[in-house]
Amino acid sequence: REVEKTACPSGKKAREIDESLIFYKKWELEACVDAALLATQMDRVNAIPFTYEQLDVLKHKLDELYPQGYPESVIQHLGYLFLKMSPEDIRKWNVTSLETLKALLEVNKGHEMSPQVATLIDRFVKGRGQLDKDTLDTLTAFYPGYLCSLSPEELSSVPPSSIWAVRPQDLDTCDPRQLDVLYPKARLAFQNMNGSEYFVKIQSFLGGAPTEDLKALSQQNVSMDLATFMKLRTDAVLPLTVAEVQKLLGPHVEGLKAEERHRPVRDWILRQRQDDLDTLGLGLQGGIPNGYLVLDLSMQEALS
């Protein structure tokens, strides 16, 4: 609701932004605080225990001063006033400094990502043109699930160099479509690392790996754990031989028994010869019986 325009009482005109203002009524704040003074001393507002109603008045004053959107010097110091902003307000802003982004994320720390924060991040990333490493570092520190909240299209703007900022927990909620986009970037980012170091870094991204990369890994004694194996793409696992899976998992191969009813293990078992499965000595059942001919129907379709 618009605050009525009333003259400032004699002697009450604010000469600076300080604690005395907490005793001002809403209409007095409106009448006695100059918006330009407020803007130049925004960094003081957060230290003053204004009520939410008083903050509404201060926001209204800034809106009048900056109808096209606030400048960054003001945005960076909004503090709790940021919680009063609507996504529509934030869409008018041009936020370019990582310090500004951090300052506003700090205000919302510990809460779910609000529509305001989502809009702020969107404005910031679009302004930068890509999701660089420093930005990704900052965003995942505040919101570990941030990366997985992006669409595959948005993820395509992540440069391979930014992948170094990604921690395994940042990928926990990513689906296969997202990992399909991230995996090639990770492969590129970590390509100069040696075998064991490379595997440690690439492991969280393997849900986007194709069959040929899994075959290559099986030759490197990586000892993939079952949790990682269970996140692999089913279509990438199916063509692997029993020998390749055994090499890929190393001592963890015994865990297949506990997962034999779950994908991708279940589907992979159905594609293997029972004889080959028996060589593992795990009692895995459901493979192709001896003497049966395996027809690769996908090959047949390709030929017709």
Epitope: D34, A39, T40, P71, S73, V74, H77, S97
Partner: nanobody, 114 residues
Framework: QVKLEESGGGLVQPGGSLRLSCTAS????????LTWYRQRPGNERELVAS??????????ADSVKGRFTISISRDNGKMITYLQMNSLKPEDTAVYLC?????WGQGTQVTVSS
Amino acid sequence: QVKLEESGGGLVQPGGSLRLSCTASGSIWSASGLTWYRQRPGNERELVASITTGGETTWYADSVKGRFTISISRDNGKMITYLQMNSLKPEDTAVYLCNSRSYWGQGTQVTVSS
């Protein structure tokens, strides 16, 4: 940490002009604006003019409106705020101090006298 250093004060005749400078260094990004205060002997410190760090917005006390102009520039990671004081009056005599958040400069003396 922010370091503020004022310069440009001096003795000037009524109606004359002076230009004060305040050089701010350190983590100055943490301030929303820079402010000039003045302290007259036996008087309260008075806010004279302030400006946002981006230079978009300025504010002046009624007593200096139309006579003083505040501006800002950046140079090698430092921020310099200028206070151009025209049509000076004897009542403008004071120590002028630069302020940013809780940081203060040492002040520079301005004396307006014939």
